[in-house]
Amino acid sequence: APVPPGEDSKDVAAPHRQPLTSSERIDKQIRYILDGISALRKETCNKSNMCESSKEALAENNLNLPKMAEKDGCFQSGFNEETCLVKIITGLLEFEVYLEYLQNRFESSEEQARAVQMSTKVLIQFLQKKAKNLDAITTPDPTTNASLLTKLQAQNQWLQDMTTHLILRSFKEFLQSSLRALRQM
């Protein structure tokens, strides 16, 4: 697994650097998770041909993965910091069940999958400190999540591979959209 943010060789080599601001820490955390996703995607793509699947075929899959839309206030047009932040946190909370699903899906990158899951929890905490309107954040229902997890794990091998690929691809896109929006805040 990669070294967590704040412990990379650059930091070791530069002990007199200014401590990271809240925004820099969040940015670095997202970049760290993206590195993890990249490693997991490599294993997935080496194992199956899912990465070559067309978007049209993938779109038929009925996974309800969080996605950024213009109404969420994270795009340049209609940008709204608070609405956007709520969307990012809510989306990450919704992704947690899917990240749990990924935990037993990797052989050589098991540690990496755990690192992505744990780093996402840390990112959520960072963002919750930044949010003013925590009441607007809806936490997914544990019972619904549990039954979703059971359903996903009961799929045949091909569908499980497809699900894994879709989760990684969607999570990467969601994080990139979040990174872009957070840099405006």
């Epitope: 970049r31 993206l34 978007k55 795009f75 990467k172 896109e173 990139q176 959209s177 872009r180 840099r183």
Partner: antibody, heavy 119, light 107 residues
Framework: QVTLKESGPALVKPTQTLTLTCTFS??????????VSWIRQPPGKALEWLAL???????RYNPSLRSRLTITKDTSKNQVVLTMTNMDPVDTATYYC??????????????WGQGTLVT | DIVMTQSPATLSVTPGDRVSLSCRAS??????LHWYQQKSHESPRLLIK???QSISGIPSRFSGSGSGSDFTLSINSVEPEDVGVYYC?????????FGAGTKLELK
Amino acid sequence: QVTLKESGPALVKPTQTLTLTCTFSGFSLTTSGMCVSWIRQPPGKALEWLALIYWDDDKRYNPSLRSRLTITKDTSKNQVVLTMTNMDPVDTATYYCARSYDDYLYYALDYWGQGTLVT
Amino acid sequence: DIVMTQSPATLSVTPGDRVSLSCRASQSISDYLHWYQQKSHESPRLLIKSVSQSISGIPSRFSGSGSGSDFTLSINSVEPEDVGVYYCQNGHSFPLTFGAGTKLELK
């Protein structure tokens, strides 16, 4: 391989609207992390970034030219279009489109078109 | 806007020289700094991304260093084909901005 090519009028009259098209191949502008930018360079001068469009249709503009610029994409045609209204002689420049693609959105422009000179 | 200041404006070199080109940002841009080379009548070409990451197809004599707001592009042993203008670019915040360039010429 990745290629980008700009097309549009070589000559534009003052107050007219300039429409430039960037036609690309070798990548998809639906891939997350993918962006296309427009940059211009007046003769003998430095580069000036104008606008950028993301894979998901979000956009960014240079504030100094914001009111005059519109960037759009047509994914099916692999094209990005830039329109610039109210052209002036000072807008004479070579206009480039360029791609950036990385996980972290660092906006390093790794592939450029050949440029089109607009007078 | 983040202002990128490059120095010197012109650099006259002899083939084989080791040269350093400087770029300073008006505020910290972390490692969101890229270098381009533009030869006469050609499009710019990405040389180095994110301060020091090498680009496929770019000769190893080109290297980058720095952090925060001070950056350097080094050419280990200048070749005649390295003549051109070198630009640094801020990729940290919008608008994306370029330096005015350093012109590398042969003595």
